[in-house]
């Protein structure tokens, strides 16, 4: 029961996280014009991974895409790559984890297969989250470096008469969305890995021997006691009847209300 809950919660948390990573990647506000200690302008600049935008006080907003690959800073390309890798891994992880969910039955898929798929998706979510966090952190570091560089020579004057105010950029909303989303995906991945441990069957390698007692048609497997893993609801020993591999959790062929988070 707790395994199902952990797995389901891990899936939901990762789903939210990956949606956040996608949102952050698409957002235009990765860096925004620093308004602190600057003359008040009628124009507000902000930049994303794919385009830069200018919002005028009149409400008019103009965005221009970066229609070049070679002309862009290597760091920006690296951030783009990290975010895309994070999205791709996360999407694959989601796909895998859907089939790995304990509450969803696909044919006669064994617990061991589901456990492996859960672990795979968990690892994918962890890597996806790390990619997003790394991407956002690299961009944030780039911003901090540029911020202090532009602060150092903020005013470049001609004989002290004419001043050019350099536009300084600070952290945009997308960075915080990215950090939170990456963290959620990471947490979701860890939960999936934990759920995997609870799903994995730890049976002994004894051969199943059938004892036919008179008047009973029940096949009893001596190796039918599952060792407790300490995870989830599988803390009490459970006998496996009918020669099948189903535990008491799985006797119902329809999902119970407890199978949903």
């Amino acid at each position: 029961m707790a395994v199902t809950a952990c797995q389901g919660l891990g899936f939901v948390v990762s789903l939210i996280g990956i949606a956040g990573i996608i949102a952050a990647t698409c957002m235009d506000q990765w860096s925004t014009q620093d308004l602190y200690n600057n003359p008040v302008t009628a124009v507000f600049n902000y930049q994303g991974l794919w385009r830069s935008c200018v919002r005028e006080s009149s409400g008019f907003t103009e965005c221009r895409g970066y229609f070049t690959l070679l002309g862009l800073p290597a760091m920006l390309q690296a951030v783009r790559a990290l975010m895309i890798v994070g999205i791709v891994l996360g999407a694959i992880g989601l796909l895998v984890s859907i089939f790995a969910l304990k509450c969803i039955r696909i044919g006669s898929m064994e617990d061991s297969a589901k456990a492996n798929m859960t672990l795979t998706s968990g690892i994918m979510f962890i890597v996806s989250g790390l990619c997003a966090i790394a991407g956002v952190s690299v961009f944030a570091n780039m911003l901090v470096t540029n911020f202090w560089m532009s602060t150092a020579n903020m005013y470049t004057g001609m004989g002290g008469m004419v001043q050019t105010v350099q536009t300084r950029y600070t952290f945009g909303a997308a960075l915080f969305v990215g950090w939170v989303a990456g963290g959620l995906t990471l947490i979701g991945g860890v939960m999936m890995c934990i759920a995997c441990r609870g799903l994995a069957p730890e049976e002994t390698n004894y051969k199943a021997v059938s004892y036919h007692a008179s008047g009973h048609s029940v096949a009893y497997k001596p190796g039918g006691f599952k060792a407790s893993t300490g995870f989830g609801s599988n803390t009490k020993n459970k006998k496996i009847y009918d020669g099948g591999a189903r535990t008491e959790d799985e006797v119902q062929s329809y999902p119970s209300k407890h199978d949903y988070v």
Epitope: P39, A42, V43, V54, E56, S58, G59, E62, T167
Partner: antibody, heavy 118, light 113 residues
Framework: QVQLVESGGGVVQPGRSLRLSCAAS????????VYWVRQAPGKGLEWVAV???????NYADALKGRFTISKDNSKSTLYLQMNSLRAEDTAVYYC????????????WGQGTLVTVSS | DIVMTQSPDSLAVSLGERATINCKSS????????????LAWYQQKPGQPPKLLIY???TRESGVPDRFSGSGSGTDFTLTISSLQAEDVAVYYC?????????FGQGTKVEIK
């Protein structure tokens, strides 16, 4: 067509208040910013204030606190509340519409004269 | 506040000749985000409200004759009347549309020589 008509000007004593109105037609105040600009007799143009489409306002530093710009979207009317008037506030007051992109005043009213005199 | 300085204060040009008015701002009016200059030029004839001629430093407002042109970037801007006509006699103002408050230049009076 776009039209701006100012009203409310006149002779007022120093220290008194006056409210100017600007009736806008041919466009909506929810879509465009509108400015007040003044011109003292025989002098150049002086930017006074602006109220943007969203309702945000900006003022000339020297007038902040004494002058208040506002608008009534339903009446399509812009206002300039002028308090503690001084002799140097004597001018023709124009209201002008912002063009939207690249921030310039594309339509102007004919102006209303405010004379501050004792 | 941003100081807008126009030169000359007055200008006398023969009909059909070129008239050039300069405007200098105390800070750059070029926005790095879109590489646009936030400067406008206005024409004011006696007893009339100002009329927008040029915005964005170089874009002519619709209905404005093509003899009027704007140029410059950053802090230095120019309004050029390529062939002065009698109806161009007026006072011309440049305006900062970038920094609040939006300040005007002191104006340049154009007359016929």
């Amino acid at each position: 067509q776009v039209q701006l008509v100012e009203s409310g000007g006149g002779v007022v004593q120093p220290g008194r208040s006056l409210r100017l109105s600007c009736a806008a037609s041919g466009f909506t105040l929810t879509s465009y910013g509108v400015y007040w600009v003044r011109q003292a007799p025989g002098k150049g143009l002086e930017w006074v204030a602006v109220v943007w489409a969203g309702g945000n306002t900006n003022y000339a530093d020297a007038l902040k606190g004494r002058f208040t710009i506002s608008k009534d979207n339903s009446k399509s009317t812009l206002y300039l509340q002028m308090n503690s008037l001084r002799a140097e506030d004597t001018a023709v007051y124009y209201c002008a519409r912002d063009r939207g992109r690249l921030l310039a005043m594309d339509y102007w009213g004919q102006g209303t004269l405010v004379t501050v005199s004792s | 506040d941003i100081v807008m300085t126009q030169s000359p204060d007055s200008l006398a040009v023969s009909l059909g000749e070129r008239a050039t008015i300069n405007c200098k701002s105390s800070q750059s009016l070029l926005n790095s985000g879109n590489q646009k200059n936030y400067l406008a030029w206005y024409q004011q004839k006696p007893g009339q409200p100002p009329k927008l001629l040029i915005y964005g430093a170089s874009t002519r407002e619709s209905g404005v004759p093509d003899r009027f042109s704007g140029s410059g970037s950053g802090t230095d801007f120019t309004l050029t009347i390529s062939s002065l006509q009698a109806e161009d006699v007026a006072v011309y103002y440049c305006q900062n549309d970038y920094f609040f408050p939006f300040t005007f230049g002191q104006g340049t009076k154009v007359e016929i020589k």
